[in-house]
């Protein structure tokens, strides 16, 4: 596969991953609980996210409450917010770096420097994936640990929410995409013939007197 194709595929995966990460960050489904209230027919589910918590009735009625005070939030939520938002912003920066280093753009002159810019973009996406993976795994660890903690009553036991799974899928796409961008950039630097067109100098037209100019005669 040519480096241009790797670049395009990598960028598409990173963009989808970025979208998934924004979705995971905003969704209130980082941890979910099912709770049966008053009778077994009326099911009530509680969702908790980084920014709000929601209560969903079986009737479909949903009531969400945005967290009031940042200081009142747990360390885990504050750290998860910072890291996830950081990852989203880093992906935004990585997009511009990658576009600048892309073969189809003219921001940077073709050559090894352009390939290095593309490589930087790929590395940024890899870092973005790793950065997002930290809060996702940390949160999942807390949810699982509390689920099996006997001091936590069943009413407070949560399960892994959809946002975590979306987040993990997004980080996988970001890291695979970033890896492909790095591969594409590496192909450019190590095998220029596969990426940049070879510049042949135009042949000089022979003079009327033949191959040699008169000045060559003594």
């Amino acid at each position: 596969m040519g480096s241009a194709a790797l670049e395009i595929l990598g960028l598409v995966l990173c963009l989808v991953g970025w979208g998934g990460l924004i979705l995971a960050c905003g969704l209130p489904m980082w941890q979910v609980t099912a709770f049966l209230d008053h009778n077994i027919v009326t099911a009530q589910t509680t969702w908790k996210g980084l920014w709000m918590s929601c209560v969903v009735q079986s009737t479909g009625h949903m009531q969400c409450k945005v967290y009031d005070s940042v200081l009142a939030l747990s360390t885990e939520v504050q750290a998860a917010r910072a890291l996830t938002v950081g990852a989203v912003l880093l992906a935004f920066v990585a997009l511009f770096v990658t576009l600048a280093g892309a073969q189809c753009t003219t921001c940077v002159a073709p050559g090894p420097a352009k390939a290095r810019v593309a490589l930087t973009g790929g590395v940024l996406y890899l870092l973005c994936g790793l950065l997002a993976l930290v809060p996702l795994c940390w949160f999942a660890n807390i949810v699982v640990r509390e689920f099996y903690d006997p001091s936590v009553p069943v009413s407070q036991k949560y399960e892994l929410g959809a946002a975590l799974y979306i987040g993990w899928a997004a980080t996988a796409l970001l890291m695979v995409g970033g890896g492909l961008l790095c591969c594409g950039a590496w192909v450019c630097t190590s095998r220029p013939d596969l990426s940049f067109p070879v510049k042949y100098s135009a042949p000089r037209r022979p003079t009327a007197t033949g191959d040699y100019d008169k000045k060559n005669y003594v």
Partner: antibody, heavy 118, light 113 residues
Framework: QVTLKESGPGILQPSHTLSLTCSFS??????????VNWIRQPSGKGLEWLAS???????YINPSLKNRLTVSKDPSNNQAFLEVTNVDPADTATYYC??????????WGQGVMVTVSS | DIVMTQTPSSQAVSAGEKVTMSCKSS????????????LAWYQQKPGQSPKLLIY???TRESGVPDRFIGSGSGTDFTLTISSVQAEDLADYYC?????????FGSGTKLEIK
Amino acid sequence: QVTLKESGPGILQPSHTLSLTCSFSGFSLNTYGVGVNWIRQPSGKGLEWLASIWWHGKTYINPSLKNRLTVSKDPSNNQAFLEVTNVDPADTATYYCAHARAQLLDYWGQGVMVTVSS
Amino acid sequence: DIVMTQTPSSQAVSAGEKVTMSCKSSQSLLYSGDQKNYLAWYQQKPGQSPKLLIYLTSTRESGVPDRFIGSGSGTDFTLTISSVQAEDLADYYCQQHYSYPLTFGSGTKLEIK
């Protein structure tokens, strides 16, 4: 076998602080899953749960007494503690400590009678 | 908080009779994660500390005679003593072990005729 015993002042004046100690044997408050609960029972009345303290230091306190209750532990001496500040005659009761198995109270102390009176 | 309501407040029965007492919770004690009801029963004999009899609605604590039977689901629970013995003279309390704060019923006093 598991045993728990509460100790305290017996009688104290209103607005003072009640300090109770639960000395236990047969388990350690350093062991995973172990907790100690405090419960009280006014004479001739029902049971009221006050607080829990767990092996990892997490505590749960009854919201109706949140500002007045403090629970702590000394696992090395097999002891748990309850402090109730600013007591009044309504705090007169028998105070129990109990071993927790999740949110169940499976072993209870004999109780200590506390009277708040001027 | 979950409010626990016990009825009757007291009842007198003869030895050998069957007795039932009721406990209602203000919200369901059924946890959807394991489909179990988080309700326990305690027995407190005169001058003694409470003793755990039954938990998870119907599971007897070790050493508890099988004449003590717990049943119910959701918000309505029952403790049945199939054949009352003289030593069963006590106060019986239900407790939800579903959420904090842990709450108890006001108790049912069992008297022997």
